[in-house]
């Protein structure tokens, strides 16, 4: 025998103290499934968090976070605070990265510079706070009578931090 | 222009029927609005009809009164609802309202069509 | 099926009274009622949700209170454009579920 709440589509729940009609979502309660049993709270963002999609009766609302943070975890579970290029984020807030690490982001961790000589390179733009150091050409491309000389490697787009 | 009218009304005789229609511009039916149908008397209450799902499933929502007489229904594809209403009477005689209950109102009926007057006499 | 009782079902006052309706449900209804205004010859306006929530662009001289089976509309500061018919309707879906109340008419004292 068919369950009569298989018939509830997505919107409404299955009503069981009213013979297991369908009943709308109350306002602030979703169901994204159809034959649900009751509907699920709506997602309040609060606080840090700012509304990005509204709840609506068959979706959850969707947060980001507010100027100066940025979402973590699954569907932003978290909002963290922004740090300026060149800092990390600490237990005791942000802290320019160390000499001989870098961060490109408002977030993330401060990364060691390329070591340019393990690839047989030399250092074409020292490193900073906020930047990688640009690796050129090997030292013997550079010595007298070479043939030709490589042309300097592009500095290369900023990378995604690690999460 | 976000709106809702109402056309299909007129004088029918007793006994007849009659199907009103009720189109939507401006916004599309969607499982966050109930269209309804409420009607009014010369110089009576407000008395609500019923409401049918806005999403692609036909559930309806009745008053009691109308089982057997009054059928809604709705055309997605023309963004429509219909009210079909068999075997009219007399007290059947009022202004028809389409009204768009909406869940972000509380299912309140946050859109009114201008009503559509059914008389019914012989 | 639920019932809705409105009183009182008319009442005359002036401009600046403080108004006062109320509506009873025949059956817990929680916080699912709505009031509207309707004027000779117009559809209803929503002027109230989910009891208390007042609608887009409606003045704030208007308040909803109540849960459960009753409920109350309450005009502040009556203005001449407040002279109407209110109804109180149940918005607690399913069959017969979304009654209104038979109103209460509002006249110039």
């Known amino acids: 025998l068919q369950d009569p709440c298989s018939n509830c589509p997505a919107g409404t729940f299955c009503d069981n103290n009213r013979n297991q009609i369908c009943s709308p979502c109350p306002p602030n309660s979703f169901s994204s499934a159809g034959g649900q049993r009751t509907c699920d709270i709506c997602r309040q963002c609060k606080g840090v968090f700012r509304t990005r999609k509204e709840c609506s009766s068959t979706s959850n609302a969707e947060c980001d976070c507010t100027p100066g943070f940025h979402c973590l975890g699954a569907g932003c579970s978290m909002c963290e605070q922004d740090c300026k290029q060149g800092q990390e984020l600490t237990k005791k807030g942000c802290k320019d990265c160390c000499f001989g690490t870098f961060n490109d982001q408002k977030r993330g961790i401060c990364r060691p510079w390329t070591n340019c000589s393990l690839d047989g390179k030399s250092v074409l733009v020292n490193g900073t706070k906020e930047r990688d150091v640009v690796c050129g050409p090997s030292p013997a491309d550079l010595s007298p009578g070479a043939s030709s000389v490589t042309p300097p490697a592009p500095a290369r787009e900023p990378g995604h931090s690690p999460q | 222009e976000v709106q809702l009218v109402e056309s299909g009304g007129g004088l029918v005789q007793p006994g007849g029927s009659l199907r009103l229609s009720c189109a939507a511009s401006g916004f599309s039916f969607s499982a966050n609005y109930y269209p309804c149908w409420v009607r009014q008397a010369p110089g009576k209450c407000l008395e609500w009809i019923g409401c049918i799902y806005g999403g692609s499933s036909d559930i309806t929502y009745d008053a009691n009164w109308t089982k057997g007489r009054f059928t809604i229904s709705r055309d997605n594809s023309k963004n429509t609802v219909y009210l079909q209403m068999n075997s009219l009477r007399a007290e059947d005689t009022a202004v028809y309202y389409c009204a768009r209950s909406a869940w972000y109102s509380g299912w309140g009926g946050d859109l009114w069509g201008q009503g559509t007057l059914v008389t019914v006499s012989s | 099926d639920i019932q809705m009782t409105q009183s009182p079902s008319s009442l005359s006052a002036s401009v600046g009274d403080r108004v006062t309706i109320t509506c009873q449900a025949s059956q817990s209804i929680s916080n699912r009622l709505a009031w509207y205004q309707q004027k000779p010859g117009k559809a209803p306006k929503l002027l109230i949700y989910?009891?208390?929530t007042l609608a887009s662009g409606v003045p704030s001289r208007f308040s909803g209170s109540g849960s459960g089976t009753d409920f109350t509309l309450t005009i502040s500061s009556l203005q001449p454009e407040d002279f109407a018919t209110y109804y109180c309707q149940s918005t607690y879906y399913g069959n017969d579920g979304n009654a209104f109340g038979c109103g209460t008419k509002v006249t110039v004292l």
């Open positions: 989910s009891a208390s």
